[in-house]
C-alpha cells in the first residue's frame, strides 16, 4: 500500500477519506487505527457502528469521528481540533473476523496555524509537499508519500 499524506492546520478539523470497493467489503465494519512505530501494531482509535447497516452513523472517540458510506465505498474520518501530537501514521481498515484488511495507509501532518504566533517548533511533518493531489474539505490536503520519504520522524 502507498501512503497518502493528509495535511491539516493545528486547532482546525482534518477530514481523511479512504475509498474502497463497496462490494468487496460488503457487510464489513471499518476502523481507524494508529500505527505504533514502523513495525509495530496498529492501535484501534475508533470503529464504525456494530450494526453494519448503521455504519453511516457518525461514531466518536474523543476528538476522532468515523462514518462509512457503504454504498459509495468511502470511509471518512474526522480529526477535530487537530493537535501536534495527532501527527503520525494511521490506517483505514476493513474488519472481518480476526482479519483487518488495510484500505489505505495515511500520514497525518499538522501544520502551524498561520494566525497563531506561538512557537511552532514542536510541530512535525516529513517535508514540504512537491505536489498536492487532492484538496479535501475542512482544510485537508492529501498527496501520496513520495518515494524515499520516511513516514516516521527520525528517532534520536
Amino acid at each position: 500500500h502507498n501512503t497518502t499524506v493528509f495535511q491539516g492546520v493545528a486547532g482546525q478539523s482534518l477530514q481523511v477519506s479512504c475509498p474502497y470497493d463497496s462490494m468487496k467489503h460488503w457487510g464489513r465494519r471499518k476502523a481507524w487505527c494508529r500505527q505504533l512505530g514502523e513495525k509495530g501494531p496498529c492501535q484501534r482509535v475508533v470503529s464504525t457502528h456494530n450494526l453494519w447497516l448503521l455504519s453511516f452513523l457518525r461514531r466518536w472517540n474523543g476528538s476522532t469521528a468515523i462514518t462509512d458510506d457503504t454504498l459509495g465505498g468511502t470511509l471518512t474520518i474526522t480529526l477535530r481540533n487537530l493537535q501536534p501530537h495527532d501527527a503520525g501514521l494511521y490506517q483505514c481498515q476493513s474488519l472481518h473476523g480476526s482479519e483487518a484488511d488495510t484500505l489505505r495507509k495515511v500520514l497525518v501532518e499538522v501544520l502551524a496555524d498561520p494566525l497563531d504566533h506561538r512557537d511552532a517548533g514542536d510541530l512535525w511533518f516529513p517535508g514540504e509537499s512537491e505536489s498536492f493531489e487532492d484538496a479535501h474539505v475542512e482544510h485537508s490536503i492529501s498527496r501520496s508519500l513520495l518515494e524515499g520519504e520516511i513516514p516516521f520522524p527520525p528517532t534520536s
Partner: antibody, heavy 124, light 107 residues
Amino acid sequence: EVQLVQSGAEVKKPGESLKISCKGSGYSFTSYWIGWVRQMPGKGLEWMGIIYPGDSDTRYSPSFQGQVTISADKSISTAYLQWSSLKASDTAMYYCARLGHYSGTVSSYGMDVWGQGTTVTVSS
Amino acid sequence: DIQMTQSPSSLSASVGDRVTITCRASQSISSYLNWYQQKPGKAPKLLIYAASSLQSGVPSRFSGSGSGTDFTLTISSLQPEDFATYYCQQEYAVPYTFGGGTKVEIK
C-alpha cells in the same frame, strides 16, 4: 438464475499441469468472492482459498499455498484453479463456491452458491 | 489454523426425531460460523450462516445457535430428505476451516 458451472472431469498423469475453471452467471461476478474447496474420496471438505475477481485479491490456506494457483478472468466471469505439477494425492473432487453478501451484525458470508464440482484423477 | 471439531461423527435417527449436532472451535470465533448439508454425489448446500441466520429457502426446522467456541445445529423434526452429512465452517480467520462432518443415517 445464479449459477457456477465448472469444467469437466480430468484424468492426468503425475507431473502434468492442469487448470480447471468455474464460470459464473446470473450475477455480478466481480462483486463476490469465489472460493475453492477440495474433497478427497470418502473424506470431508477442505478450504483451499478465495479470490475476489474484481481485483484478483487472493487468500490461500497454508496447506495449499505454493501447491495450487487461484486466478480469475473477470472479462469472462471465470475463476481458475491450477496445478503446475500434479501428484497422485491431488486426486479429488474440487468445488468452486461463491461467498454470499450478508449485512447483519457479523459479516459471516457463507458459501451460498456452489458449482457442480470437477473430478480430478491423477494416476500413472 | 483454527481447528473445528464436530460431534458426533455419525448418528442414527428416525424420521420425526430431534437431532442436535455440535461444533467446537479451537479458539473463539464470535459468530463467524456456517453450517452446510451435503448429500452423496452432490455439492454442499448452505443452511445457516453467522451461527444462527437461516439461509433463504432452507426449511425452518433447521436452526443454529452458539457463539465463541461452541455451536449447535438442530433439526427439530428429521425428514427423509435430511439424511446427509453436515459440516460446520468457521469464517473468523483464513483459512476458513471446516469441521470433519457428521453423517446422519436412518435408524
